[in-house]
C-alpha cells in the first residue's frame, strides 16, 4: 500500500478540469489561463474493513492546500464539501473516516468516485460548464460521473 499521496490531474470526458474558486471546486473547460488543481489521492490503509468489489477506497485532497473532499448531509441530501484537513491525518486514523472516503472504480480509462458514507452517490459535474462538483445518484443523465485520471510526477 502506498504511504504517500499520489498527485493526479483529473478531467471529465468533456475535457473540463477541476478549479478551486472561493473554496468550491468547479469544472471548467481547459484553457490557457485556467490553473487546474492537482488532486492528492491515497488509498485507505484499512481496506480490509471496507466493502470489497466496489472499488479502491481512497481519500481525495487538494495538493498542498490542506483541503480534502468529504460528503455530509445537508437536510436529506448528501452534499460534496471541501474541509480543511491533512490527507495524511485521515490516512493514519485508526478507522476509515468514511465521510472523506470514496470508492475509486476504473473501467478502461474512466474513473468513478462513489461516496463510502453514502453508497450510490457519486462525484459528478453538470453537463453544463462552470458548475460546482456535486454528488449525484443519477448516473449518465444530466451529470457526468466519469473522469480521467493522469498520474503526475
Amino acid at each position: 500500500k502506498s504511504e504517500m499521496p499520489q498527485p493526479v490531474s483529473i478531467q471529465d470526458i468533456n475535457h473540463r478540469v477541476w478549479v478551486l474558486q472561493d473554496q468550491i471546486l468547479i469544472a471548467v473547460p481547459r484553457k490557457d489561463r485556467v490553473s487546474p488543481v492537482t488532486i492528492s489521492l491515497i488509498s485507505c490503509r484499512h481496506v480490509e474493513t471496507l466493502e470489497k468489489d466496489r472499488g479502491n477506497p481512497i481519500y481525495l485532497g487538494l495538493n498542498g492546500l490542506n483541503l480534502c473532499l468529504m460528503c455530509a448531509k445537508a437536510g436529506d441530501q448528501p452534499t460534496l464539501q471541501l474541509k480543511e484537513k491533512d490527507i495524511m491525518d485521515l490516512y493514519n486514523q485508526p478507522e476509515p473516516v468514511k465521510s472523506f472516503l470514496f470508492y475509486h472504480s476504473q473501467s478502461g480509462r474512466n474513473s468513478t468516485f462513489e461516496s463510502v458514507a453514502f453508497p450510490g452517490w457519486f462525484i459528478a459535474v453538470s453537463s453544463e460548464g462552470g458548475c460546482p462538483l456535486i454528488l449525484t445518484q443519477e448516473l449518465g443523465k444530466a451529470n457526468t460521473t466519469d473522469f480521467g485520471l493522469t498520474m503526475l510526477f
Epitope: 480490509e48 474493513t49 471496507l50 466493502e51 484537513k85 491525518d89 493514519n92 486514523q93 485508526p94 478507522e95 476509515p96 473516516v97 468514511k98 465521510s99 458514507a117
Partner: antibody, heavy 121, light 109 residues
C-alpha cells in the same frame, strides 16, 4: 440523546455461550463503529473487538478471535456480542461503546451501562 | 501484545492539578497510538474525555487536557473539582487493535 442500552445480567455454565445485546438510539449506528470491552472483577478494561454496522465488517483482539462474534441488526439499531466456550475467567462486565469521529479524531464517547456475565458451575 | 500501564491510584486536592499517565510496554507512546481517555464516575456509565492524544470530546470541560509526556500519554486535570473523583482509563491503538490500561482511581480530597 445518544444512548446505548444493554441486555440484562446472565449466568452461564462453563463451556456454554452467551449473547449480549446493545441497542443504540439518538444516532444512526451506520455512522459509527461499535466496540465491545470487558472488565473482570478488580481488573482493568479489555478490548474485545468492533463492528462497522454499515457494512458488517469486524475486527477482534487476537486473544478473542474465534470465541467472540460481533454482529449487527441495523433494522433495530442493535449490536450483539456472542461469546462461546465460556470459562470462569470470562466472568466480567461486558460493555458496548461507540467510537465516533468528531472534528479531527475518534472518541470512545458513549458507553452502555454494562452487562454482568457470570460463568459458574 | 503490548501491556498498557496506569497509576493504580492518585489523590489531588480540590483546585489542584494532577497528571495521570499511560505507559506502553512496547516503547514510547506517540501520536500514532491515538490515545483515548475515558472516565467512569461511581454508579455512572463511562464517558469519553480525550481522543487522538489531545482532542477534547464535545462538552468536556477545558480543565481536562491530553498530551504526550516523557514517552507516555498523559491526562492533566487543572483545577480539580470534587466531581472529578472517578476511575480513568486510557486506550492506545496498535495497528489493528486497541489496548486499554488498568485504570487510575482518582480521589479528590
Amino acid at each position: 440523546q445518544v444512548q446505548l442500552v444493554q441486555s440484562g445480567a446472565e449466568v452461564k455454565k462453563p463451556g456454554a455461550s452467551v449473547k449480549v445485546s446493545c441497542k443504540a438510539s439518538g444516532f444512526n449506528i451506520k455512522d459509527t463503529y461499535i466496540h465491545w470491552v470487558r472488565q473482570a472483577p478488580g481488573q482493568g478494561l479489555e478490548w474485545i473487538g468492533r463492528i462497522d454496522p454499515a457494512i458488517g465488517t469486524t475486527r477482534y483482539d487476537p486473544k478473542f478471535q474465534g470465541r467472540a462474534t460481533i454482529t449487527t441488526d441495523t433494522s433495530t439499531s442493535t449490536v450483539y456480542l456472542e461469546f462461546s466456550s465460556l470459562r470462569s475467567e470470562d466472568t466480567a462486565v461486558y460493555y458496548c461503546a461507540r467510537l465516533h469521529y468528531f472534528g479531527n479524531n475518534f472518541f470512545f464517547d458513549y458507553w452502555g451501562q454494562g452487562t454482568l456475565v457470570t460463568v459458574s458451575s | 501484545q503490548a501491556v498498557v500501564t496506569q497509576e493504580p491510584s492518585l489523590t489531588v486536592s480540590p483546585g489542584g492539578t494532577v497528571t495521570l499517565t499511560c505507559r506502553s510496554s512496547s516503547g514510547a507512546v506517540t501520536t500514532s497510538n491515538y490515545a483515548n481517555w475515558v472516565q467512569q464516575k461511581p454508579g455512572q456509565a463511562f464517558a469519553g474525555l480525550i481522543g487522538g492524544t489531545n482532542d477534547r470530546a464535545p462538552g468536556v470541560p477545558a480543565r481536562f487536557s491530553g498530551s504526550l509526556l516523557g514517552g507516555k500519554a498523559a491526562l492533566t486535570i487543572s483545577g480539580a473539582q470534587p466531581e472529578d473523583e472517578a476511575d480513568y482509563f486510557c486506550a492506545l491503538w496498535f495497528s489493528n487493535h486497541w489496548v486499554f490500561g488498568g485504570g487510575t482511581k482518582l480521589t479528590v480530597l
